[in-house]
Interface confidence: low
């Protein structure tokens, strides 16, 4: 009795079990009854990768240089060309028929893996304490400088587009120093003032003299800094912040202190 | 008859430009990649340069890039290579050759007759 | 930058078979050519995608390529064949040649 099915790696034809042809040949001829089914190898640019009954091989994938791509690794009678894609441009299917330009990581992004032939850049914001600012396929966020390292102090606080900037400790102590110089500037002028109305209220007990040009007060010799002989630090020059030179510490001597 | 015929080749003081042409003939000249070749006196073949069929892509051997420019004129049938900033190193046999069909498959399957190019002060 | 490396010179009685070597990184991945060039003329390819024959090349050229190595095989090699010989591949968008192999039929 004729089969109904048959075994792995055969196929039923005219009521007959006949071999599938092995990876890498096609059918030429069924089996028949007292024959086996006959085979033949594919071509050089062709392949099967299974066993089957193909009258016809497949071709060979070509890898277009002109889509980017170029061979991976090349076909053989039971595989096909693998392709993939040229220095910096990736897949855009799995099946990778064409290639497409790496995508950068754009300011305050940075790249968490960099694109191989077949798959793009995987981009990541950048977290506090870290930034980038360019755009970039292959740059990952950096950290933000550590401006105590370097002995200076954060003038200006960074993002993830920009690093933070630095400056000397000076302008720090500038910000301190200023107000206290503007209070004690302030208190002076009231004093001033009340002593010039206790004078002007005085009873003239003396002789009369001839009327006195009222004196011109100038209130910036009573500022300290202004005295050479009072002690003030040398980067405050009439509660101006001076620059610190490059080399000289900012500290007050013992002397300056006293 | 495909036939390639390359002309400009000559003389040139370093520094100085040249520009290659090669007609090309007997065949689709859209239809294929075309690449420049030179071989230096006694040397072997050292590939310069190909175009792709359509013209869209470009590809220059490191030692020349930025330096040389690869460019097709259909119209003309001609391939061209603009060479400036000519080193004494260039000195060449400059040929142009078709490439066979689809780039690495085929290779280069018809070749110019060569023009010489002679860098020198 | 991909290299391919081949002798300088090799040797052959007429009649006998010449193999001219190609070596390179995994180059049984990439497609050789072959290209005969004859002292004074322009090279013509004997072999593409590593062993089919152009029309008009002998069909004793043969070539074959596997692991790091193609080789270009010349049977019953003949005076007529005494040249250099030239391996080429592409590779990442260059086109890479061999420093050549000149082949001396003796006798």
């Known amino acids: 009795e004729p089969p109904t099915a048959c075994r792995e790696k055969q196929y039923l034809i005219n009521s007959q079990c006949c071999s599938l042809c092995q990876p890498g040949q096609k059918l030429v001829s069924d089996c028949t009854e007292f024959t086996e089914t006959e085979c033949l190898p594919c071509s050089e640019s062709e392949f099967l990768d299974t066993w089957n009954r193909e009258t016809r091989c497949h071709q060979h994938k070509y890898c277009d240089p002109n889509l980017g791509l170029r061979v991976q690794q090349k076909g053989t009678s039971e595989t096909d060309t693998i392709c993939t894609c040229e220095e910096g441009l990736h897949c855009m299917s799995e099946s990778c028929e064409s290639c497409v330009p790496h995508r950068s990581c754009l300011p305050g992004f940075g790249v968490k893996q960099i694109a191989t032939g077949v798959s793009d850049t995987i981009c990541e914001p950048c977290p506090v304490g870290f930034f980038s600012n360019v755009s970039s396929a292959f740059e990952k966020c950096r950290p933000w400088t550590s401006c105590e390292t370097k002995d200076l102090v954060v003038q200006q606080a960074g993002t993830n587009k920009t690093d933070v900037v630095c400056g000397p400790q000076d302008r720090q102590r500038a910000l301190v120093v200023i107000p206290i110089c503007l209070g004690i500037l302030f208190v002076i002028l009231l004093l001033v003032l009340v002593f010039i109305k206790k004078v002007a209220k005085k009873p003239n007990d003396k002789a009369p003299h001839p009327k006195q040009e009222p004196q011109e007060i100038n209130f910036l010799d009573d500022l300290p800094g202004s005295n050479p002989a009072a002690p003030v630090q040398e980067t405050l020059h009439g509660c101006q912040p001076v620059t610190q030179e490059d080399g000289k510490e900012s500290r007050i001597s013992v002397q300056e202190r006293q | 008859e495909v036939q390639l015929v390359e002309s400009g080749g000559g003389l040139v003081q370093p520094g100085g430009s040249l520009r290659l042409s090669c007609a090309a003939s007997?065949?689709?000249?859209?239809?294929?990649?075309m690449s420049w070749v030179r071989q230096a006196p006694g040397k072997g073949l050292e590939w310069v340069s190909v175009?792709?069929?359509?013209?869209?892509?470009?590809y220059y051997a490191d030692s020349v890039k930025g330096r040389f420019t690869i460019s097709r004129d259909y119209s003309k049938n001609t391939l061209y290579l603009q060479m400036n900033s000519l080193r004494a190193e260039d000195t060449a046999v400059y040929y142009c050759?078709?490439?066979?069909?689809?780039?690495?498959?085929?290779?280069?399957?018809?070749w110019g007759q060569g023009t010489t190019v002679t860098v020198s002060s | 930058s991909y290299e391919l490396t081949q002798p300088p010179s090799v040797s052959v009685s007429p009649g006998q078979t010449a193999s001219i070597i190609c070596s390179g990184d995994?180059?049984?991945?990439?497609?050789v050519c072959w290209y005969q060039q004859k002292p004074g003329q322009s090279p013509v390819v004997v072999i593409y995608?590593?062993?089919k024959r152009p029309s008009g090349i002998p069909e004793r050229f043969s070539g074959s390529n596997s692991g790091n190595t193609a080789t270009l095989t010349i049977s019953g090699t003949q005076a007529m064949d005494e040249a250099d010989y030239y391996c080429?591949?592409?590779?990442?968008?260059?086109?890479?040649f061999g420093g050549g192999t000149k082949l001396t039929v003796l006798g």
């Open positions: 007997g065949f689709t000249f859209g239809s294929y990649a």
């Open positions: 995994k180059l049984g991945d990439k497609y």
């Open positions: 080429q591949v592409w590779d990442s968008s260059t086109v890479v």
């Open positions: 050759a078709k490439e066979g069909g689809d780039y690495y498959y085929y290779g280069m399957d018809v």
């Open positions: 175009i792709s069929d359509s013209g869209g892509r470009t």
């Open positions: 995608h590593d062993n």
